[in-house]
Interface confidence: medium
């Protein structure tokens, strides 16, 4: 169709090699948002503070970490953003009323082993999945 | 050790079946937070509104959906929370200054197919992963 042809002619004016999701990612030092970008933060969780000291034998706590920060346009390459997050970021940037920004959440989690008493006071060693944040990203 | 034995005795007084990290999840209908819980919301993304109409041939847009809502203590079972999110929710509940609440993010995403012009004005049909939110959860 003429429309397609017109669009095809327009399209050919764009620069080459604007690769993929990496592209989002160029203006790393954009001043468009002043808040700290999405990243992993320190967090030590004490089982005593959670009131779990009577049934968790070991460890006494663990380095859990947590994710916090902005997922603002443009998304930098280290933000591990999904395609949906990139689209949502752009939708938010163009019209903030439509949707919130994507949120900063764990992209990789590790397990920890916990020694605890079960309901019959047996000592159990169990591996708990997804307990420690290894990496954060925009989702 | 005496400490372990003491803790074991204490443990036996606690209610049964408090299996590990599931514990945080019990009070399904808690009134502790009035804001709407984490869930999937409607979002239609128009490629014209994003300014992509000149190189995306089809579709004109797509139902992308997005995730929004509270991830407050206690986390309900349908919130697809990770163990880390359950721990973080509890830490936040006990001391809100320590960490933010977990955030509401996609837990399952689907692909869409897009017909578009590449840099040489060839028409390309490609499947793009992680474009549509299928389910949301607390992370």
């Amino acid at each position: 169709s003429t429309g397609s042809k017109q669009r095809s002619q327009n399209r050919s004016k764009t620069p080459k090699n604007q690769e993929a999701l990496r592209m989002a990612n160029v203006a790393e030092n954009s001043s468009s948002d002043q808040r700290q970008a999405c990243k992993k933060h320190e967090l030590y969780v004490s089982f005593r503070d959670l009131g779990w000291q009577d049934w968790i034998i070991a460890p006494e706590g663990y380095a859990a970490y947590y994710c916090e920060g902005e997922c603002a346009f443009p998304l930098n390459s280290y933000m591990n953003a999904t395609n949906h997050a990139i689209v949502q970021t752009l939708v938010h940037f163009i019209n903030p009323e439509t949707v919130p920004k994507p949120c900063c959440a764990p992209t990789q989690l590790n397990a920890i082993s916990v020694l605890y008493f079960d309901d019959s006071s047996n000592v159990i060693l169990k591996k708990y999945r997804n307990m420690v944040v290894r990496a954060c990203g925009c989702h | 050790s005496t400490g372990s034995k003491q803790r074991s005795q204490n443990r036996s007084k606690t209610p049964k079946n408090q299996e590990a990290l599931r514990m945080a999840n019990v009070a399904e209908n808690s009134s502790s937070d009035q804001r709407q819980a984490c869930k999937k919301h409607e979002l239609y993304v128009s490629f014209r509104d994003l300014g992509w109409q000149d190189w995306i041939i089809a579709p004109e847009g797509y139902a992308a959906y997005y995730c929004e809502g509270e991830c407050a203590f206690p986390l309900n079972s349908y919130m697809n929370a990770t163990n880390h999110a359950i721990v973080q929710t509890l830490v936040h509940f006990i001391n809100p200054e320590t960490v933010p609440k977990p955030c509401c993010a996609p837990t399952q995403l689907n692909a869409i197919s897009v017909l578009y012009f590449d840099d040489s004005s060839n028409v390309i049909l490609k499947k793009y992963r992680n474009m549509v939110v299928r389910a949301c959860g607390c992370h």
Partner: nanobody
Framework: EVQLVESGGGLVQAGGSLRLSCAAS????????MGWYRQGPGKQRTLVAR???????NYADSVKGRFTISRDNAKNTVYLQMNSLKPEDTAVYYC??????????????????WGQGTQVTVSS
């Protein structure tokens, strides 16, 4: 790379009008949104108005009904018509462009580009 050149700023009395222009050059075809931010003395840079190449617009509450953003896609130029100007509109006005694209390996946006800024002063 996208270069943005602003013009049309100046000194005007309260109640007067100005028209700002911003022309994009370089790889301007891939621009999918353009707009204006402003920064008053000692203040943060805030959105004034933006328009996509598809024609969708949105405005800061403080300028609704007084400012109009428009775009000439053929010239890769965005305009900001400012009427009923107030002293609180005094600021440096920055043009910006959002540049984005899809490719065979993924989905994404390139980034945002900014002009050098043009001074608008509204005297009472």
């Amino acid at each position: 790379e996208v270069q943005l050149v602003e013009s049309g700023g100046g000194l005007v009395q309260a109640g007067g009008s100005l028209r700002l222009s911003c022309a994009a050059s370089g790889s301007a075809f891939s621009i999918n949104a353009m707009g204006w931010y402003r920064q008053g003395p000692g203040k943060q840079r805030t959105l004034v108005a933006r328009i996509t190449s598809g024609g969708s617009t949105n405005y800061a509450d403080s300028v609704k009904g007084r400012f109009t953003i428009s775009r000439d896609n053929a010239k890769n130029t965005v305009y900001l018509q400012m009427n009923s100007l107030k002293p609180e509109d005094t600021a440096v006005y920055y043009c910006y462009a959002v540049h984005s694209k899809l490719s065979t390996t993924g989905w994404g946006t390139i980034g945002d580009y900014w002009g050098q800024g043009t001074q608008v002063t509204v005297s009472s």
